[in-house]
């Protein structure tokens, strides 16, 4: 039975700034025909038929749900893209993470401007801080890493704060072993 395809993002962020670029790729098993991909944005069929969908100079209207489909195989699980206009944007490698998987957070400045004295907060408490911009990289996420995150920083000498982002770490499903 062919597997469901999966949509991946490059760069891997599903929250981006207006004007930025992102490529969505429809990955699946043994899909050789490059022109047989269907893309759906908020339920509407896109004109794009390649396995990659390029979003160039993102607009607010590009926000929403994306799904892909190869041939008559099931549609992929949805991926949600959100386009922002702000000074700071907290980006995460994933908003729902399986326990034991990596989690990466980035405090992204508008137009890639330098951000100084970046502080990450989790559930209202300062979590990580440094003189310049920096990231949080958790190798093995645990349920305790679930929470509401945001970042603050200085851009052109002024203090700014990102919108909050909810991160959920879910327990990995237990393998079932059957006695023969």
């Amino acid at each position: 039975v062919p597997q469901k395809p999966k949509v991946s993002l490059n760069p891997p962020w599903n929250r981006i700034f207006k004007g930025e670029n992102v490529t969505l790729t429809c990955n699946g098993n043994n899909f050789f025909e490059v022109s047989s991909t269907k893309w759906f944005h908020n339920g509407s069929l896109s004109e794009e038929t390649n396995s990659s969908l390029n979003i160039v100079n993102a607009k607010f209207e590009d926000s929403g749900e994306y799904k892909c489909q190869h041939q008559q195989v099931n549609e992929s699980e949805p991926v949600y893209l959100e386009v922002f206009s702000d000074w700071l944007l907290l980006q995460a490698s994933a908003e729902v993470v399986m326990e034991g998987q990596p989690l990466f957070l980035r405090c992204h400045g508008w137009r890639n401007w330098d951000v100084y004295k970046v502080i990450y907060y989790k559930d209202g408490e300062a979590l990580k801080y440094w003189y310049e911009n920096h990231n949080i990289s958790i190798t093995n996420a645990t349920v305790e890493d679930s929470g509401t995150y945001y970042c603050t920083g200085k851009v052109w000498q002024l203090d700014y704060e990102s919108e909050p982002l909810n991160i959920t770490v879910i327990k990995a499903p237990r393998e079932k072993y059957w006695l023969q």
Epitope: Y116, K128, Y129, N135, I136, T139
Partner: antibody
Framework: EVQLVQSGAEVKKPGESLKISCEGS????????IAWVRQKPGKGLEWMGI????????KYGPSFGGQVTISADKSINTAYLEWSSLKASDTAMYYC??????????????WGLGTLVTVSS | QSALTQPRSVSGSPGQSVTISCTGS?????????VSWYRQYPGEAPQLIIY???GRPSGVPDRFSGSKSGNTASLTISGLQPEDEADYYC??????????FGTGTKVTVL
């Protein structure tokens, strides 16, 4: 009360390995950077590097990358400074210090009492 | 990254003022307002006395003040007292994840 307790003085021969420690107490260890600072006899302070125990983010001073290894074990609230092959020039007092976020400022607010390392044949 | 430059020693009589300079570059002192000052008594660990150029931690007397102009930071001790005799170090964030200390200044109370 915040405390940084460092391991005791060490006397080693050139070529030997060594790992010294700095145990933090009285605060949430994983959420504060720990730096290591060298002071050679009669000389000034040199920033060696720093680690954030929460995610093991580690940064080294330009003269120290590849010469030492900084690590931390957040389960026992301890940071480490390690040499694989000591040299006589490593003889110094080594301080650990906490880099904290205090009212929006990033400062070294607490220091250990230092570990004296003597390397001599 | 070189150490920040401080005078080797300064001295003054009790009650006088002394100023210690700390000269760096646009890449450290001149580029960031993350300049700190530490006092170190012989055989002891350093103690923070000034942060963010001019901030004073609680418990540090207001005789200690910090300032910055261009690539040079300064520490002024007014109303010098015998217990101020110690080594003083400036420090600054220097970009690219590097932190740098000054060469150190010995303050002598005559």
């Amino acid at each position: 009360e915040v405390q940084l307790v460092q391991s005791g003085a060490e006397v080693k021969k050139p070529g030997e390995s060594l790992k010294i420690s700095c145990e933090g107490s009285g605060y949430r260890f994983s959420s504060y950077w720990i730096a290591w600072v060298r002071q050679k006899p009669g000389k000034g302070l040199e920033w060696m590097g720093i680690i954030y125990p929460y995610d093991s983010d580690t940064k080294y001073g330009p003269s120290f990358g590849g010469q030492v290894t900084i690590s931390a074990d957040k389960s026992i609230n301890t940071a480490y400074l390690e040499w694989s092959s000591l040299k006589a020039s490593d003889t110094a007092m080594y301080y650990c210090a906490r880099l904290a976020l205090i009212r929006g400022s990033i400062i070294f607010d607490y220091w250990g009492l230092g570990t004296l390392v003597t390397v001599s044949s | 990254q070189s150490a920040l430059t401080q005078p080797r020693s300064v001295s003054g009589s009790p009650g006088q003022s002394v100023t210690i300079s700390c000269t760096g570059s646009r890449g450290d002192v001149g580029g960031y307002d993350f300049v700190s000052w530490y006092r170190q008594y012989p055989g002891e660990a350093p103690q923070l006395i000034i942060y963010d150029v001019s901030g004073r931690p609680s418990g540090v007397p207001d005789r200690f003040s910090g300032s910055k102009s261009g690539n040079t930071a300064s520490l002024t001790i007014s109303g010098l007292q015998p217990e101020d005799e110690a080594d003083y170090y400036c420090s600054s964030y220097a970009g690219s994840e590097i932190y740098v200390f000054g060469t150190g200044t010995k303050v002598t109370v005559l």
